[in-house]
């Protein structure tokens, strides 16, 4: 066959669908690879062809569109399963071609099983809700296009394994689930089961997402430097190890980049000719507030090093702060035989 622009296996689109449920999969060519849509391609006389490679096989084979009850069908740029079976797992290819043009892309499709509590190997989207906030909603995802607007599906929501009914702080409202209050106890998986009729059959769509309750933006503050502080003096003798922790608290802020860094005499440690190492550790609270600790370490400090300025800096979307560490050279304790004896006038 003539040359075809092969975009390879699009592993960015790791599509997972539940067994025994409808699935509609759009050909990725029009979404990510080509600058025109299906309608334009179709008008230009291009044909969309589908084929697949079964799991653990190398042989590409055409998709059987003549199964009973049209279990697998194609509609425009969408491949339909009504419903999926476990052995539909494999790599699917959509190819757009005519006599002079050819472009194709493959993508993996995994049909997964779920248990009665909706546990499965499915990768779940995470939805963050704010603590101490007003009413917040999550929406049943990826159900568009499965049924026409004239069809009124029934939607049942679950928290983990529990059907959400008369909950104190969570109210199902069709495709939405409203949280009157979001508690840390609300962390976990929420599932909507959408049931709709089609051609005398009943289909179910199961969609699970993870809710994570995080700090509220109205409680967010600029970074707080707990250490260094004015109460601690780093007093060292030359040759000793100097260890200064910089500990910073960051309020949770959606999409904020939290940064901590040291300067020595106003320069980055890399730009100073001394042997400095910096180790960082990060911990998170239950609401994803963050505490970062950067420990500045000089193995054998010199008297010159003890005269330098050591400043810890922190920055988030809420602002930037800095705090200097108080570093001093320890005054050696007097040695009795010489200093004290001389002091007492001994000869």
């Amino acid at each position: 066959s003539e040359r075809c622009d092969d975009w390879g296996l699009d592993t960015m689109r790791q599509i997972q669908v539940f067994e025994d449920e409808p699935a509609r999969i759009k050909c990725p060519l029009f979404e990510h690879f080509l600058k025109f849509n299906y309608s334009t391609a179709h008008s230009a006389g291009l044909t969309l062809i589908w084929y697949w490679t079964r799991q653990d096989r190398d042989l590409e084979e055409p998709i059987n569109f003549r199964l009973p009850e049209n279990r697998i069908s194609k509609e425009k740029d969408v491949l339909w399963f009504r419903p999926t079976l476990l052995n539909d797992t494999g790599n699917y290819t959509c190819m757009l071609r005519n006599t002079t043009y050819c472009s194709k892309v493959a993508f993996p499709l995994e049909v997964v099983q779920k248990d009665s509590c909706f546990n499965s190997p499915m990768k779940l989207p995470v939805h963050k809700l704010y603590i101490e906030y007003g009413i917040q909603r999550i929406t049943c995802p990826n159900v568009d296009g499965y049924f026409p607007s004239s069809v009124k599906p029934t939607i049942t929501w679950y928290m983990g394994c529990y059907k959400i009914q008369n909950f104190n702080n969570v109210i199902p409202e069709g495709m939405n689930l409203s949280f009157l209050i979001a508690f840390i106890s609300n962390n976990g998986n929420y599932t909507c089961v959408v049931t709709y009729p089609e051609n005398g059959r009943t289909f179910h769509l199961t969609r699970t997402l993870t809710v994570k309750v995080v700090g509220s933006p109205k409680n967010a503050v600029p970074p707080v430097i707990h250490s260094p502080n004015d109460h601690v003096v780093y007093e060292k003798e030359p040759g000793e190890e100097l260890l200064i922790p910089c500990t910073v608290y960051f309020s949770f802020l959606m999409d904020s980049r939290n940064e901590v860094w040291w300067t020595i005499d106003g320069k980055k440690p890399d730009d100073i000719p001394i042997d400095v190492t910096i180790n960082e550790s990060i911990s998170h609270s239950r609401t994803e507030d963050e505490t970062r600790t950067q420990i500045l370490s000089i193995k054998k400090v010199t008297s010159e090093d003890l005269k330098r300025s050591y400043v810890c800096h922190a920055r988030s979307a809420k602002g930037e702060v800095a705090k200097a560490a108080t570093v001093k050279q320890k005054v050696p304790a007097p040695r009795y035989t010489v200093e004290l004896a001389c002091g007492f006038g001994a000869t």
Epitope: I131, Y133, N168, L180, I181, S185
Partner: antibody, heavy 119, light 107 residues
């Protein structure tokens, strides 16, 4: 530390009205919601009503729905329970309690105020 | 409404005893359960939330466990100040409901 102090209890005739207050001292209410809980003499605790901190949505127990109204005045840091069409079975100590914002729990309680409905 | 059933209703024990109170919910409430202590003429005091988390300032001899429909409150070594009535409280389903109480009295 916030403290809650109830007032407004007393003796009232059946069919009468009473307004209970719950004032927060030492800070604002905070939390996710404010609740009223009652306890009839020698009996257990019974939840009566709540009002959400954000949005002000009110919820009631079936036994008081249509008769009791919960409200709050944030400027005065005070929670109210307006009780109308009182019945003998409403006789109880009424507590206000704060619902925590982190976890479902009533973490601060007032000392209670006694409401007696009797002719 | 969810029924919260505590057992026993009354419990006679001595200082130093290990005491266990059970609370059963008529339907699953996950871990949305709290325990309170109440002394005569006083307001309830929060001991345990989220079924097993100890409220700040509460002695570590108090502990909670359970999930779903079966929950327990345990006092590992009863102290004189622990003689009181204890209530479980479910906060998942509307309306909030409490157990009928368990009175811990001196044997």
């Amino acid at each position: 530390e916030v403290q809650l102090v109830e007032s407004g209890g007393g003796l009232v005739q059946p069919g009468g009205s009473l307004r209970l207050s719950c004032a927060a001292s030492g800070g604002t209410f905070g939390g996710s919601a404010m609740h009223w809980v009652r306890q009839a003499p020698g009996k257990g605790l019974v939840w009566v009503s709540r009002i959400l901190t954000y949005g002000g949505i009110a919820t009631y127990a079936e036994s008081v729905k249509g008769r009791f109204t919960i409200s709050r005045d944030n400027a005065k840091n005070t929670l109210y329970l307006q009780m109308n069409s009182l019945r003998a079975e409403d006789t109880a100590v009424y507590y206000c309690a704060r619902g925590s914002s982190e976890y479902p729990k009533f973490d601060i309680w007032g000392q209670g105020t006694l409401v007696t409905v009797s002719s | 409404d969810i029924q919260m059933t505590q057992s026993p209703s009354t419990l006679s024990a001595s200082v130093g005893d290990r005491v266990t109170i059970t609370c059963r919910a008529s339907q699953s409430i996950s871990s949305w359960l709290a325990w309170y202590q109440q002394k005569p003429g006083k307001a309830p005091k929060l001991l345990i939330y989220d079924a097993s988390s100890l409220e700040s300032g509460v002695p570590s001899r108090f502990s909670g466990s359970g999930s779903g429909t079966e929950f327990t409150l345990t006092i590992s070594s009863l102290q004189p100040e622990d003689f009181a009535t204890y209530y479980c409280h479910q906060l998942l389903i509307y309306p909030h409901t409490f157990g009928q109480g368990t009175k811990v009295e001196i044997k």
